[in-house]
Interface confidence: low
Amino acid sequence: HTAAQDNCTCPTNKMTVCSPDGPGGRCQCRALGSGMAVDCSTLTSKCLLLKARMSAPKNARTLVRPSEHALVDNDGLYDPDCDPEGRFKARQCNQTSVCWCVNSVGVRRTDKGDLSLRCDELVRTHHILIDLRHRPTAGAFNHSDLDAELRRLFRERYRLHPKFVAAVHYEQPTIQIELRQNTSQKAAGDVDIGDAAYYFERDIKGESLFQGRGGLDLRVRGEPLQVERTLIYYLDEIPPKFSMKRLT
C-alpha cells in the first residue's frame, strides 16, 4: 500500500492531499506545494516536506541557530526546488535571484551568489550529528537503555536501517545520535538519514509529520525523555565552500 486504503490517507505524511484516483482506483497521495506523488509506505523526502510546509501559511517558524563551527541550518525555512525524485536541487534561489548551493539535506554549503552561481552536483550529507539536551531527571538515564530506545525509535518509527545509526553517546544531560550513510551504503528503498533526522527534529518540536499519530512519547524504562534543546550538525562527503568572511 502506498496509502491507507480504507480512508485514503497518507500515514507517513500529513502534508498531503489524497484521493482514490490512482491505477485501479487505488488511493494516491500528493504532497502539498509540489503536487508530487509520494510513497506513503516510507518517509517523504525533506525537500518535499519543506515545500509543503512553505505552502501552509501558518508555519512560519525558524530553525535552530547553533554555532557556525559546523555546517548547520542557519538560514531557516525557504521554499526549495526539488527534482523529479523529490531531492533538493543542488542550486537553490530565492525570489530576488539570490542563489546558493545546498547539500542533500537542503542546508546551504556555499556563500550566497547571483544567478551565475554554479552548483555542479548535489553533495551528499553522509554524517549527521544530532545533539540533544534533555530536561533534568531524578538521575542519569542508563546508557544502554537509552541507546536501545533511540535505536528502536529510528528503526520502528522512521524505518531507518539500524546500520545507519552509527552511535548513541550519552553524558548527562547531553545525548548525541550519530547517523552515517555513505552514497555506496544507501540501497534502493533505504530511508535517507537526512529525512529520518528531519522527521525526528519535527517530532522533538512537537510538530509530528505522521498522520493521525500522537506526538512523540519518548520513554526510557518508563521515564519520560524530554528534550529541551536540539542542535543538528551536518557533515558532507565534500567539505563546504565558504569564503573566510563567513568563518570569522
Epitope: D147, A167, H169, Y170, L235
Partner: antibody, heavy 117, light 107 residues
C-alpha cells in the same frame, strides 16, 4: 591515503606541560573524531579523550579531565593534546587516532613523552 | 565506566592452530566492540569493528562474534605474523575503554 602525523618525542620535568600535535591528511578533517590514546611502557591502551574538529566538541576521560586540553586548527588540519602537571607515571607513548563511528581506523605513529627529573 | 575484561591474558599456540580470544563487558553494550592487533613498537591496527564487521585489507582468518556482554575474536589458523597483543575496545559510551589485552605467543 589517510595519514596522521604526530610531533616528535619530548622529555619533560615533573610539573611541566607537554603539547603533542597530530596533523591529518587524506580525508575530510572535520568529519571524524580524533581520539588520544596513551600506552605506558609494557602496559595496555588507555583512552584519554577525543575532539570533533567540526565544532571542537570534546569528551575527556574523567581521569585526565583536570589536566588535559584538546584543541584543533582547521586551517592546518591539526589537533593538539596538551597534558599539564606532568608526573612520572605520564611517561608513555601518546597516539592520536581518527574515529569514524566504526572503530579507530587510522593511527598516528605515536609520540613518546618521557617525564623525568 | 564500562570495564572490559579480556581472557586469557596469554595464549600460547602454534602456527596453524585456532585462537579464540574473549572480551567481556561489565554491562550490555550491544555490538559496540572493536578489536585491534598491536605488535611491539607499532601503533594498534583495527581488525574488526562493531563486533563482527570485517575491515578491508584484513585477512579473512580474523573474525568476530558476540553481542551484549560477551565477545569473541577468532583467528582460524594462526600465521607467524599473527603473534601479537590483541585488544578489544568499546564505543558504546564515553569514556571509551580498552580491555587489558591478550598476548598470543608462539608455543
Amino acid at each position: 591515503e589517510v595519514q596522521l602525523v604526530q610531533s616528535g618525542a619530548e622529555v619533560k620535568k615533573p610539573g611541566a606541560s607537554v603539547k603533542v600535535s597530530c596533523k591529518a591528511s587524506g580525508y575530510t578533517f572535520t568529519s571524524y573524531w580524533i581520539n588520544w590514546v596513551r600506552q605506558a611502557p609494557g602496559q595496555g591502551l588507555e583512552w584519554m579523550g577525543n575532539i570533533y574538529p567540526s565544532n571542537s566538541y570534546t569528551n575527556y576521560n574523567q581521569k585526565f579531565k583536570d589536566r588535559v586540553t584538546m584543541t584543533r586548527d582547521t586551517s592546518t588540519s591539526t589537533v593538539y593534546m596538551e597534558l599539564s602537571s606532568l608526573r612520572s607515571e605520564d611517561t608513555a607513548v601518546y597516539y592520536c587516532s581518527s574515529y569514524r563511528s566504526d572503530g579507530f581506523a587510522y593511527w598516528g605513529q605515536g609520540t613518546l613523552v618521557t617525564v623525568s627529573s | 565506566e564500562i570495564v572490559l575484561t579480556q581472557s586469557p591474558a596469554t595464549l600460547s599456540l602454534s602456527p596453524g592452530e585456532r585462537a579464540t580470544l574473549s572480551c567481556r563487558a561489565s554491562q550490555n553494550i550491544g555490538t559496540s566492540i572493536h578489536w585491534y592487533q598491536q605488535k611491539p613498537g607499532q601503533a594498534p591496527r583495527l581488525l574488526i569493528y562493531f563486533a563482527s564487521e570485517s575491515i578491508s585489507g584484513i585477512p579473512a582468518r580474523f573474525s568476530g562474534s558476540g553481542s551484549g556482554t560477551d565477545f569473541t575474536l577468532t583467528i582460524s589458523s594462526l600465521e607467524p605474523e599473527d603473534f601479537a597483543v590483541y585488544y578489544c575496545q568499546q564505543s558504546n559510551s564515553w569514556p571509551f575503554t580498552f580491555g587489558g589485552g591478550t598476548k598470543v605467543e608462539i608455543k
